[in-house]
């Protein structure tokens, strides 16, 4: 797995460099997670044809993966910093159960899957420090999450491969939207 942001040798060897601002650190963290997702997607797409066939194969998706909508204030039109930040944090917290599901779903990228999960936890902490209105952030119910995880794992192999593909694709899209929005803040 790649070295998490701030832990590469260049950072150690350059003590005179200006420390990263909070925004830069968040930006770097998201880009690091996106790199990890790319590696996981590569393994998923090489293993099966889910990536090409998912559109035709899937009739209905009840996974309820977090998604950015106009009302969340993260798009250029109707941009609202506070509303958007709450949505990003809430969405990341909702993705955590799906990232937990992804553990043990990869053979050659097992460490990478763990790195994506851990880096997301760190990103949430960074963003929570930035947020003023923490009361507006709803944390997913652990019982509901446990039940969902059981259901995800009870699916047959083909559906689990499809689920893995859908989670990675949605998480990538969510992070890309978050990155664009955070650069406006």
């Amino acid at each position: 797995a790649p070295v998490p942001p701030g832990e590469d040798s260049k950072d150690v060897a350059a003590p005179h460099r200006q420390p990263l601002t909070s925004s830069e650190r968040i930006d770097k963290q998201i880009r690091y997670i996106l790199d990890g997702i790319s590696a996981l997607r590569k393994e998923t797409c090489n293993k099966s044809n889910m990536c090409e066939s998912s559109k035709e194969a899937l009739a209905e998706n009840n996974l309820n993966l977090p998604k950015m909508a106009e009302k969340d204030g993260c798009f250029q039109s109707g941009f609202n910093e506070e509303t958007c930040l709450v949505k990003i944090i809430t969405g990341l917290l909702e993705f955590e159960v799906y990232l937990e599901y992804l553990q043990n779903r990869f053979e050659s990228s097992e460490e990478q899957a763990r790195a994506v999960q851990m880096s997301t936890k760190v990103l949430i902490q960074f963003l929570q420090k930035k947020a003023k209105n923490l009361d507006a952030i709803t944390t997913p119910d652990p019982t509901t999450n446990a039940s969902l995880l059981t259901k995800l794992q009870a699916q047959n192999q083909w559906l689990q491969d499809m689920t893995t593909h859908l989670i990675l694709r949605s998480f990538k899209e969510f992070l890309q939207s978050s990155l664009r929005a955070l650069r406006q803040m």
Partner: nanobody, 125 residues
Amino acid sequence: AVQLVDSGGGLVQAGGSLRLSCAASGRTFSSSPMGWFRQAPGKEREFVAAISGRSGNTYYADSVKGRFTISRDNAKNTVYLQMNSLKPEDTAVYYCAAERVGLLLTVVAEGYDYWGQGTQVTVSS
């Protein structure tokens, strides 16, 4: 053990109708997707229709749209396929299928967990 029992097949003339039934036992499928697939001699098993357990939404193969209707009776744990305006090319063994979780609904056979034994439908011209 979970069992799906297909029935209602038979020999019918082109333009006629049949109603297939699939009764499930061994567990409740009210929140699970259920579907119908068919296999003609020498051909691969193909998707015909499916119904969601959650939304009740229905999905059809283009070749049967407007002619076939899938429905379910959760109280009876049964799914139906009403087939109208039958054509000779509808001749096949029809299989009922169910998936146990219900998070995703697919038109791919590999996405289903339980299968009926099949019922033969023959449409003569």
